[in-house]
């Protein structure tokens, strides 16, 4: 059986008003006001279950219940509730009407009764403009009287002594003589407690901690020079002696340097001063996590909530009979707790506002064994908004897809657990994908054909009724390639350019009325599209940077068949660098000279339009330059043996040389030197 501990809607205030101050019972109106701005209406009840009326909340978040002239049928105890969209408040204080010509019965209450301390008695009188009188049992005359002071009065006993103990009641009366009196309030017994009021007790960090965390408990009271005791599960575990040094409030800090799994539990504290002890503090539940598997947290009906509406967060655990806690990122203490017999708990966030947006998580823990807790659930983002955020639509691996290949369109956004809908321009029906716990929606298109190309957008599609506005994503253009002859792509002034320089990529097609699309390997979307008047598009790249390096290609499509694109141009590698990459150097047929045979050294670089130079043992080789990178070496008198490397420079930038290649060693054939011999 689940024990509901919903954070209650704050209780409303009930009072009475009249336009006959000398005889209020001639025309009485009860008013109910709520401190909660999300109150929709008010209900007035009589004697607990008699439904008197329901009225909508005014702009001042209150409602009037006119009773008119009091009759015998009006006698009874009234209270009101405020009513929100999905919750009813605690009842107001009860207003008792005891007769047809008598004021409502007041209610008396008091602050803690501590010897030697000031005590305040509150008398709530319901009607404004009344006088108040405080009575003590056994005394004929009022102990104190106060004039018209609003709907309630505070009587003060300066210093509580034994003689002040006893039963007190209060009465209200009309402002002008002859006074008309109320019945006395129910009596309140004042007994001096040999106890101080409870201390204020808290943890400095969250009371939900991971093993090894540092925890400080703070116990404080306004009373001076107190000693403190710390309890765990009712047993004393630490104490702190009084401090005479500091005037004013007393406080003690209890530190656990490194929390262990057995340190969880219910902590409380008390303070004392010689023979007088305080009441125990409210307990703090310290929960040590990471003992049980993590729960899952889901939002119902969904994680996006219209302001003023309510949402249920369901924490699904693994074991029965645990206690659950709901946490919000940035909040010091858990927002709510639930003790359940099952393995899940529902937390209601009612009438949410913008401040309720954020990441929520939950844990569960056992209350019998040191509050051993689970890992935290994965965070769940709750959005309180009247408009869904825009999702982002993109294609993987690219929005430019060769005919027959596969592509996945991803609709991705920050909201988890919501469905997505994919819409193609010009089509009546949309593809739907219900979101799961992941925060993205995949729409796979296999074996792509011409029917798949076009403009797409997507939006969130919650599977619950919602007044939250939906925004479409960006538009994604899906091009299918391989349907026209390929264009050519070249770089001006060349494929290598220094950082900060400008370059132009020229895509040359064969057909008129074409739109050209520039692509870069690794990019999911085209870099740029152009519709030139001629057959060529010039893609201007000003002030290039290192990240502009890469492999480029281009395609084109015709005005008459947009999105049906050509084959890709040949790839073009662009280098943005001050130092061109080093070439490679190899020997053909091998690095070993054979008698009378030459060796060709082949220097190869990644860029076209270059001039190569060869170095031999650190000096320029006799055949110094080559445009194709081939150098022929002979071994006349053994001079060809040694270490070679090569470099190149771009014809467009003759002052910039590449790094040298890795060195390559040429050697002579092993064995005795060959002798010439003649046959005589």
């Amino acid at each position: 059986e689940e024990t509901e501990i919903v954070m209650p809607t704050p209780k409303p205030e009930l009072w009475a008003e009249t336009n006959f101050p000398l005889a209020p019972w001639k025309n009485l109106t009860l008013w109910c006001r709520s401190p909660s701005g999300s109150t929709k209406e008010f209900v007035l009840l009589k004697d607990g279950t008699g439904w008197i009326a329901t009225r909508p909340a005014s702009e001042q978040v209150r409602a009037a219940f006119p009773l008119g002239a009091l009759t015998q049928s009006h006698t009874g105890s009234y209270h009101c509730h405020s009513w929100e969209e999905m919750a009813v408040s605690e009842p107001s204080e009860a207003l008792e009407l005891v007769g047809t010509d008598i004021l409502p019965k007041p209610v008396i209450s008091a602050s803690p009764t501590i010897r030697g301390q000031e005590l305040q008695l509150r008398c709530k009188g319901w009607l404004a403009g009344m006088g108040f009188a405080l009575y003590k049992e056994g005394e004929q005359e009022p102990v104190q009287q106060l004039g018209a002071v609003g709907r309630e009065a505070f009587f003060t006993i300066q210093r509580m002594e034994d003689k002040d103990e006893g039963n007190y009641s209060c009465r209200t009366h009309t402002e002008k003589r002859p006074f008309k009196w109320s019945e006395p309030s129910e009596p309140l017994e004042l007994v001096i407690k040999e106890m101080y009021p409870k201390p204020f007790f808290k943890t400095w960090a969250s009371p939900v901690v991971t093993p090894g965390a540092r925890v400080t408990f703070n116990c404080s009271t306004p009373h001076q020079h107190m000693s403190f005791i710390l309890y765990k599960d009712g047993s004393e575990i630490a104490s702190s002696d009084r401090s005479w040094a500091s005037p004013g409030a007393s406080a003690a800090h209890f530190l656990i340097i490194s929390v262990g799994i057995g340190d969880g539990g219910n902590y409380s504290c008390r303070y004392y001063d010689f023979s007088i002890w305080s009441e125990p503090s409210d307990p703090v539940e310290l929960v040590v996590t990471e003992f049980y598997p993590k729960p899952t947290l889901l939002a119902q009906p969904g994680p996006v909530v219209f302001p003023g509406k309510s949402v249920i967060l369901r924490c699904q655990g693994t074991f029965q009979g645990m206690r659950f806690a709901l946490l919000q990122e940035g909040a010091h203490v858990p927002l709510q707790f639930r003790s359940v017999s099952g393995n899940s708990a529902d937390f209601l966030l009612h009438t949410v506002g913008a401040e309720d947006s954020g990441n929520y998580s939950c844990i569960y823990y056992e209350t019998t064994m040191s509050n051993r807790g689970s890992y935290l659930s994965m965070p769940l983002m709750i959005w309180v908004t009247d408009t869904f955020p825009k999702p982002w639509l993109f294609a993987e691996p690219s929005s430019v897809v060769p005919m027959g290949q596969n592509v996945t369109l991803w609709c991705r956004g920050p909201v988890h657990g919501v469905g997505y809908i994919l819409h193609k321009e010009g089509e009546a029906t949309s593809m739907q994908l219900w979101g799961s716990t992941s925060n993205d929606g995949a729409f796979p298109i296999t074996n792509i054909s011409g029917t798949s190309m076009g403009r797409y957008s997507c939006c969130y599609h919650p599977d619950w009724t919602s007044s939250i506005k939906i925004q479409p994503s960006n538009t994604l253009e899906l091009l299918v390639t391989g349907l026209l002859p390929k264009p050519s792509l070249l770089a001006q002034p060349g494929p290598m350019v220094a950082p900060g320089e400008n370059m132009t990529l020229q895509c040359q097609g064969e057909l008129p009325d074409s739109t050209f699309v520039l692509l870069k390997e690794g990019a999911q979307e085209p870099l740029e599209q152009q519709r030139p008047s001629g057959y060529r598009a010039d893609f201007w790249m000003p002030a290039v940077r290192g990240e502009d390096s890469g492999i480029y290609s281009c395609v084109y499509y015709l005005d008459s068949t947009p999105f049906a694109a050509s084959n890709h141009s040949d790839s073009l590698e662009i280098w943005v660098t001050d130092k061109p990459p080093k070439p490679s150097l190899s020997a053909w047929p091998s690095t070993m000279f054979k008698l009378g045979k030459d060796i060709t050294l082949q220097c190869r670089g990644p860029l076209p339009g270059v001039e190569f130079v060869l170095e031999h043992d650190g000096e320029e080789a006799p055949q110094q330059f080559s445009e194709d990178g081939d150098f022929v070496i002979n071994n006349v008198e053994g001079k060809g043996i040694g270490n070679y490397s090569c470099s190149y420079r771009l014809q467009a930038y003759p002052d910039i040389w590449s790094e040298p290649s890795d060195p390559l060693e040429l050697v002579g054939a092993a064995g005795p030197v060959a002798q010439e011999c003649t046959v005589g």
Partner: antibody, heavy 117, light 112 residues
Framework: QMQLVQSGAEVKKPGSSVKVSCKAS????????ISWVRQAPGQGLEWMGG????????NYAQRFQGRVTMTADESTTTAYMELSGLRSEDTAVYYC??????????WGHGTLITVSS | DIVMTQTPLSLPVTPGQPASISCKSS???????????LDWYLQKPGQSPQLLIY???HRASGVPDRFSGSGSGTDFTLKISRVEADDVGLYYC?????????FGQGTKVEIK
């Protein structure tokens, strides 16, 4: 969309009692009042009383006081109306209706109770 | 109890023409909060009643703007600007200012 589903038609003897149920689904049950309205054959509508399930609070029309009892079970989101001491003039269609301060916005389909010896 | 009186009890109408129903209460339905607690309901043949207008002049969700409510104190009117064939049925006014809530006797709207 809120739905109020009522129990089926019944034939009762004079002097007996009848208990009509009204099950709410697709909306928030506890946060509304449920009223019971009856309509005798060929006649107009007559409000019998109402209940606020979350508070267990009721109000009965004076002419049904002592004969009618309205209850609600929050766990099953069902409201009940029991009418005792049945007479032939209690033959009517009995409706449940959900309401707050803006009228009865959802109605059940009605339950015909026939009182006949 | 507050007595609600409707006129006429029967109203033959022509589609496309306006129609109006009157309702009088035996005491004022104007509350001190400024609201007038009068509602209008339509019961189509063989169906449950449905809410048309609440708190004097507020149209219920999904109700066409052909329907409007007006009045003050003790005299109230429901107007249909252009009657449609689907508008036939019994129209009831109901007061909600105090318990017990009470209905008018009903006005039967039928096509001529």
């Amino acid at each position: 969309q809120m739905q109020l589903v009522q129990s089926g038609a019944e034939v009762k003897k004079p002097g007996s009692s009848v208990k009509v149920s009204c099950k709410a689904s697709g909306g928030t049950f506890s946060s509304y009042a449920i009223s019971w309205v009856r309509q005798a054959p060929g006649q107009g509508l007559e409000w019998m009383g109402g209940i606020i399930p979350v508070l267990g609070a009721t109000n009965y029309a004076q002419r049904f006081q002592g004969r009618v009892t309205m209850t609600a079970d929050e766990s099953t989101t069902t409201a009940y109306m029991e009418l005792s001491g049945l007479r032939s003039e209690d033959t009517a269609v009995y409706y449940c209706a959900r309401g707050r301060s803006w009228g009865f916005d959802y109605w059940g389909h009605g339950t015909l109770i026939t009182v006949s010896s | 109890d507050i007595v609600m009186t409707q006129t006429p009890l029967s109203l033959p109408v022509t589609p496309g023409q306006p129609a109006s129903i009157s309702c009088k209460s035996s005491q004022s339905l104007l509350h001190s909060d400024g609201n007038t607690y009068l509602d209008w309901y339509l019961q189509k043949p063989g169906q449950s009643p449905q809410l048309l207008i609440y708190t004097l002049s507020h149209r219920a969700s999904g109700v066409p703007d052909r329907f409007s409510g007006s009045g003050s104190g003790t005299d109230f009117t429901l107007k249909i600007s252009r009657v449609e064939a689907d508008d036939v049925g019994l129209y009831y006014c109901m007061q909600r200012i105090e318990f017990p809530y009470t209905f008018g006797q009903g006005t039967k709207v039928e096509i001529k």
